[in-house]
Every structure is written in structure tokens, then in C-alpha cells.
Amino acid sequence: QRFAQAQQQLPLESLGWDVAELQLNHTGPQQDPRLYWQGGPALGRSFLHGPELDKGQLRIHRDGIYMVHIQVTLAICSSTTASRHHPTTLAVGICSPASRSISLLRLSFHQGCTIASQRLTPLARGDTLCTNLTGTLLPSRNTDETFFGVQWVRP
Amino acid sequence: QRFAQAQQQLPLESLGWDVAELQLNHTGPQQDPRLYWQGGPALGRSFLHGPELDKGQLRIHRDGIYMVHIQVTLAICSSTTASRHHPTTLAVGICSPASRSISLLRLSFHQGCTIASQRLTPLARGDTLCTNLTGTLLPSRNTDETFFGVQWVRP
Amino acid sequence: QRFAQAQQQLPLESLGWDVAELQLNHTGPQQDPRLYWQGGPALGRSFLHGPELDKGQLRIHRDGIYMVHIQVTLAICSSTTASRHHPTTLAVGICSPASRSISLLRLSFHQGCTIASQRLTPLARGDTLCTNLTGTLLPSRNTDETFFGVQWVRP
């Protein structure tokens, strides 16, 4: 036990508990496939502890490996609607800085009306995540149907 | 390093490693859309470390932000079955106390036979989570097809 | 505060930050339904911190409860392709040691081209996880469409 005490101790603030859960604010203007997000206790159950929003896009404040997760549900959608409007695709990626631009997560709706997934990925301070929805169907703004979040996991 | 040692240290028990992974026990009686869960090492790979089960529903014991995840697979299902029995919907929410009742996560099956998703959400000690399955198809009780869990992430 | 200081402290290395995110390397030879994974910074955004790869399969190095997640997208796939080649199923399980062999997570594609899910499960040092894809459609090797990972959550 004494040996354990002698090892490097972990201060609370170094745990890097950066975490955010966002709800959909609005879609972009014509030619802009990005979804614009919002978060904060005044809005319901969304929050930002560490990361920040920059014009509706999520900006990372701490280097590390993150669990990124997303669910997007298409509004006024049935399997026939979804197949009729195919292809509808959701991609999550680093969109800035441009030098680090990469797609992290991509899903197509096919005959479904909801996509949901998650992955672990290294992110660096200053990385901005964008969520691009291509297709002609609107995403639902219901907070239990469409959401996007990140959780810092380790350095 | 000495400075780090002087910062607030994190005791093991304050890490809040509350976590639970449940398997389906049974569906509710007529007019009760709730799924009833069970967990514990005697049942296989399900467990409760912190949260408790209250009549098959998951009750939270520690305030914090949680990752909630779920997968539900419909039994004896094909894409034609699923579309024939549409709409089948799964919703995860806080069902008690009534003052905090809210839907956290909602998905429809459309032409699929499995839904799976996850989200971050603040939960408080005493919150009870309910999983409501509406529709006429039974959920699979196979432990690798239907499960529900929470993981404490941060205060 | 003094009381908190007196409690058991948590050394950094005992946090068990074991984590891995893998990308698809290749599919198995005839009669071998396993997917073979690869990871490492030279390959892009995949990594192994703790777990190891053993002939393309993920081997656990630390006992604990893990969050296991996976996404697999079928290549050259549409909802008609997917239904044409049904059943296509993905199962994640412990495949060795044989005494601990069990299916942890199972999903069918039905009319979809992507499956994604996650679950909490206890894993022990030496457990090897296999991902079996049954069916006649190739999985996409795009790193944002097909990936597999684990994250240590608690002892």
C-alpha cells in the first residue's frame, strides 16, 4: 500500500474529463451540408464541459483519445421515404484545421431513418468536428432523436 | 511534479465507477410497454456496480454524467416482418421521479430488426430509467442481441 | 479534505487506460468467417494502448469491464444488395481461451448496409476477441466505415 502511495498520483484536474453532448440547432444554408449544434443546461440535457462551440461546430480543448458518438434521425421519415431519397449520408470528421481534415465516421441511411454509431479517435486541441448530412431529408430536432457528443477517454 | 502532488488528489472511491450492463428478463404485461431487465454474475455477463434494479427498472445511485447504451433485437424478425409490424419504437427515458420524466433516446425499427445507440446524459441519484418498446413484436432475450447499460463518466 | 487525502490514492498507472481502435486489414480465407484487424499510428488513426493483436485478433492485457464497440459497413452495398445476400451477420465474441468462448454482440444487416453497436462486458487478461462476418458480401476497408475498438472502463 505504501508503495502505491509512492507512485505518481493523479490530480483531479489532470483527469481530463472533457465531455460534451449537443442537440441539433439548425441545418446549414444551401450548399452547406453541415449540421449546426447547440448545448447548455438552458437548452435541456445538452452540455459542454471543456469543448466549445464555434459557429455551431464542436471545438476540442484538450489533446487525447475521445469517444465520439452520434445519432441522427430523419424527420417525417419512413423506410419508403428513406429509400426514395437515397443516398442520404452522415459523416463526422475533423474539418479544421485544414491540415488535419479527415472523415472519422460515415454512415448511409439506406432504407432506415436513423443512424447511430460511435468510435474512438485521437483528437488534438483546436480540432473542430463537423457533421455533414448529405441528401434532401431534414434531420429531426427532437433531442432524443438527434444528438452528438464526445467524451475524453485517455491522454 | 511536486506541484502536481500538492494538487487535490483523487481517492479511488470518488472516481464514481458506477456501471451496469443488463440483460432482458421479460416484457411487461398488457398495456405496459416497459422492458424488464435483470443483471448479475449468476446470469452470465451482466452486472450492476452501483446502480440497482427496482422491479426490473434501472435506478441510479450516483449523480453525474452517464453514457447510456442499448441494443434491442426483435425476435423472429426479417425486414419484411419489421415493416409489416411498423411502427415499432424503442424509447429510453427517466420515468421516475415523475418530476424528472423525460425521453432520452428514441429509435424506430422501420425495416430493420435491431436498433443500437448510445448517448451522454446527466442523471441524478434516484432517477429510474425505463425502456419502452411499443409495437407487436417481441424482443429477443438472447444476451448478445438485447442489452442495456449505463456507465458513469464524470461528476 | 484531509479525510479525502487519507483515503486510498489512485496511482496513474493503475487507472488501466487500456484502449484500442482498429481498422480492417483483410477478411479470412475460405471457411474462416473472422475479420482480421490492424492498428497503429502508421496506419492512420488506429492505435493499441495495452491490448495487442494476435494474428489480426484483439487480445486483452488487463482484467476489467470494457466498452466494446464496432461498426462494419458492407462494400458496394445498397438495401437491395443487402436483402439479396441475406442473411449477413456480424458477431463479436471471446474466441480464446476456448473455455471462455462466448458471443458478446450480434447483429444482422437485413436491408441495411451498416451495423454499429457497443456494449459493456467483463474481459480477462488473455481473452481474444474475434469478429465473425457470415455472408457473401465483403466488408468495406474504408477506415471511417469499418472499425472495432475496446476501452477499459473499470476493474
Epitope: - | - | T27, Q30, A75, I76, S83, H85, H86, T136, L138, R141
Partner: antibody, heavy 118, light 111 residues
Framework: QVQLKQSGPGLVQPSQSLSITCTVS????????VHWVRQSPGKGLEWLGV???????DYNAAFISRLSISKDNSKSQVFFKMNSLQANDTAIYYC????????????WGQGTLVTVSA | DIVLTQSPASLAVSLGQRATISCRAS??????????MHWYQQKPGQPPKLLIY???NLESGVPARFSGSGSGTDFTLNIHPVEEEDAATYSC?????????FGGGTKLEIK
């Protein structure tokens, strides 16, 4: 091991129909699809159509109006029928299948030489 | 439909030398981390035999002197060193989309 055996007539009258049966062994028709390919004299190979494991079919657009592929899973048989044959349909007709993954032909029938002539 | 153009239509190669056959697709057959191009060998009176799948994977039981390469629209089958038994017609085939199509074939003669 996987085998495909074809049976059918060698000579067909112009405007008549061609029927070939492909009997498979070593795999189940509920798991794998069976394709049909032909090779005209001195010409390359031509993909005609496929019956998938679930029973649905896809045809080369050039033949869709006169081609029909069906199967009997319990008998492990696939049936190929082409109507309104003309002299330029003279060819060797093959059934073929894949293993593990769909996209390339690992196993072929022995071929049926079909001559369209009065 | 994707058109596959093989060249040359025929070639004669000395025993032990290298034979190179090209196949060009009218549009890319590469996607999702794979190149959906395959190669077959056919001898008179026999059905085609699979040599290479997904552009570069050697089919089980096929000698290592056969190799495939390429991506996008341009693909190559190499045979080195050529042996007597390699005299045959070689065809490429894509499976990027339906209808799957074949190249016109290349007849290899051993000098």
C-alpha cells in the same frame, strides 16, 4: 467439394427456347447465388444473369426480356431458360458460383454447348 | 455498363520470360478499399479457371508465378516465368456493379 453439373440439349431450333439445369453439390443454394455466363464462338465471356441465395434475380439488360432463372433449393438445382433463340445465341453456356464472397467465379459447371440451327 | 478493354489481343512469349496482359476499365472499379477486378485462364474445351481475385489476390492452388496489380481503371496480369502449360486465353472481369462484364480475352502462345 463444390461441384456444378449442367444438363441440357445441345441443339435448339431458331425461335425456340433453351432450358439448362445446373445441379450443385458441396454447398447450399440458400447460402450462395448461381450465375450464368456464356461464350460465343471466337468471342469473349458474357455475363447473363444470377439467382441470389434468397431467390431474387438480376439479369443483363440485353437479355432481360427473354431470360428466366429459377431454382429448387431442396433439389439443389438451378434452372436457366432463354426464349426466342437465334443463330447468334450459339455459345457455350456455363453456370458458375463463388465461395465466401460474391464477385468472382471460383467454381464453374462443365459448360453446355448450344447450337441454334434449323 | 463498364467496358473492359484487354491488350494485347494475343502475344507470344518465350519460355521462362515474362508475359504482361493489360485490362483497362471504362470507369473505376475500385471502391471501399478494394479493386473489383479478377483474372481467369481458359484452355480449349474447359471452363475458365480463377487465377486472381480483387486485383492482386492469388487464388488457392494457383502458382506464384501469376500476379496481379492495379487500381482504379488500369490493371495488369503478370506471368513470370512463363511455362509451357500457361498457353491459354486470359480474361479479366469486374464486379464493381451489375452487369458484371469481361474483357475480350488475350491469347498467350509460348514460343
Amino acid at each position: 467439394q463444390v461441384q456444378l453439373k449442367q444438363s441440357g440439349p445441345g441443339l435448339v431450333q431458331p425461335s425456340q427456347s433453351l432450358s439448362i439445369t445446373c445441379t450443385v453439390s458441396g454447398f447450399s443454394l440458400t447460402s450462395y447465388g448461381v450465375h450464368w455466363v456464356r461464350q460465343s464462338p471466337g468471342k469473349g465471356l458474357e455475363w447473363l444473369g444470377v439467382i441470389w441465395s434468397g431467390g431474387s434475380t438480376d439479369y443483363n439488360a440485353a437479355f432481360i426480356s427473354r431470360l428466366s432463372i429459377s431454382k429448387d433449393n431442396s433439389k439443389s438445382q438451378v434452372f436457366f431458360k432463354m426464349n426466342s433463340l437465334q443463330a447468334n445465341d450459339t455459345a457455350i453456356y456455363y453456370c458458375a458460383t463463388y465461395y465466401r464472397y460474391d464477385g468472382w467465379f471460383a467454381y464453374w459447371g462443365q459448360g453446355t454447348l448450344v447450337t441454334v440451327s434449323a | 455498363d463498364i467496358v473492359l478493354t484487354q491488350s494485347p489481343a494475343s502475344l507470344a512469349v518465350s519460355l521462362g520470360q515474362r508475359a504482361t496482359i493489360s485490362c483497362r476499365a471504362s470507369k473505376s472499379v475500385s471502391t471501399s478499399g478494394y479493386s473489383y477486378m479478377h483474372w481467369y485462364q481458359q484452355k480449349p474445351g474447359q471452363p475458365p479457371k480463377l487465377l486472381i481475385y480483387l486485383a492482386s489476390n492469388l487464388e488457392s492452388g494457383v502458382p506464384a508465378r501469376f500476379s496481379g496489380s492495379g487500381s482504379g481503371t488500369d490493371f495488369t496480369l503478370n506471368i513470370h516465368p512463363v511455362e509451357e502449360e500457361d498457353a491459354a486465353t486470359y480474361s479479366c472481369q469486374h464486379s464493381r456493379e451489375l452487369p458484371w462484364t469481361f474483357g475480350g480475352g488475350t491469347k498467350l502462345e509460348i514460343k
